[in-house]
């Protein structure tokens, strides 16, 4: 008799999952020296105890502890990248510039970047028909409490100048909503981050409005103020430009329109 | 607009160092790549060094290992370390912003530097 299943509205666990997780870390392992250390597949079990037989809609921060425990990990607290909305702009940055981390260029972050997964109250089994979607169905989910996580963590670590990418073509350009609003911007700590530096990132070749003044920005602004945090905005009309000259800050081009 | 306001230069030894400051005001939210050049009696302007916001940095062949640019946390004050200088180091120094693809482009008045015995 095939046994019930709970049909959730998101896309259910990304195929190939255990393999994906495992393929991953030991490739990350290899390439960053000081992470060389961490075992994988108990990083592997680990990350399947937190969700592995426990109701999707029922996971908690303290599920994922093992996971955080296995993977902590140490990058320069003063060369933070957050981002909100424009992911792939943030990685192409840190790509070029390799002093600097996102969330994703950390273990834990690559493990999970753009995975999906969830298992069911009470089987082994994965679920990969299905998996609770943030809005539809609950918050508590896997992915959701894997990021908040993981964000929570990253933010804490912060220091002096913190920068945070953000994407200028949305109506919103900074998000109460986002994890960088919800979560990030709440657990920067005060007494070690002296400055969050928002860069706007422009999508029109003719925009040259000045995104800083945005009444989004400006509750960015109070926000951060009121948490005794300093505030500075950029403009970044051609992030295409901006990339060549993180590449070769040499080059004329930097400073002139050519 | 953007008003950019150097100090620091003067007179110094060969072998001697100064530390320039650039200070922004104004609409510095356009302010994304900050730089110095320098203009010696006689000769065009040339590139000395400049960083970009999240902290890249370029520098011309010829003050390389010499000299440093810095910015504070701020983001609106940058400098010039400049150490073992030498005689053919003497210019009209003059900060310089902008953003990369845009007609922002903005110049201090300069501040002399000579280096002599």
């Known amino acids: 008799v095939p046994r019930w299943r709970q049909q959730w509205s998101g896309p259910g666990t990304t195929k190939r999952f255990p393999e994906t997780v495992l393929a991953r870390c030991v490739k990350y392992t290899e390439i960053h020296p000081e992470m060389r250390h961490v075992d994988c597949q108990s990083v592997w079990d680990a990350f399947k105890g937190a969700f592995i037989s426990k109701h999707p809609c029922n996971i908690t921060e303290e599920d994922y502890q093992p996971l955080m425990k296995l993977g902590t990990q140490t990058v320069p607290c003063n060369k933070i990248l957050l981002w909100s909305r424009i992911k792939d702009l943030a990685h192409q940055f840190t790509q070029v510039q390799r002093d600097m981390f996102t969330l994703e260029d950390t273990l834990l972050g690559y493990l999970a970047d753009d995975l999906t997964w969830c298992g069911e109250f009470n089987t082994s089994k994965i679920n990969y028909q299905s998996c609770p979607d943030w809005r539809k169905d609950c918050s508590n989910n896997p992915v959701s409490v894997f990021w908040k996580t993981v964000s929570r963590r990253f933010a804490e670590a912060a220091c002096d100048v913190v920068h945070v990418m953000l994407n200028g073509s949305r109506s919103k350009i900074f998000d109460k909503n986002s994890t960088f609003g919800s979560v990030e911007v709440h657990n920067l700590q005060p007494e070690k981050v002296q400055t969050l530096e928002a860069w706007v990132i422009h999508g029109g070749r003719e925009d040259s409005r000045d995104l800083c003044q945005d009444p989004t920005i400006k509750e960015l602004e109070s926000i951060i103020s009121k948490r005794n945090i300093q505030f500075s905005c950029k403009n970044i009309y051609r992030p295409d430009k901006f990339l060549q000259c993180v590449k070769n800050p040499e080059d004329s081009s930097c400073t002139s329109e050519i | 607009q953007v008003q950019l306001q150097e100090s620091g230069g003067g007179l110094v030894q060969p072998g001697g160092s100064l530390r320039l400051s650039c200070v922004a005001s104004?609409?510095?939210?356009?302010?994304?790549?900050m730089g110095w050049y320098r203009q010696a009696p006689g000769k065009q302007r040339e590139f000395v060094a400049r960083i970009i916001i999240g902290g890249s940095t370029g520098y011309s062949d010829s003050v390389k290992g010499r000299f440093t640019i810095s910015r504070d946390n701020t983001g609106n004050t940058w400098y010039l370390q400049m150490n073992s200088l030498k005689p053919e180091d003497t210019a009209v120094y003059y900060c310089?912003?902008?953003?990369?693809?845009?007609?922002?482009?903005?110049w201090g008045q300069g501040t002399q530097v000579t280096v002599s015995s």
């Open positions: 310089n912003a902008g953003n990369p693809g845009t007609r922002y482009i903005y």
């Open positions: 104004g609409s510095i939210s356009n302010i994304i790549t």
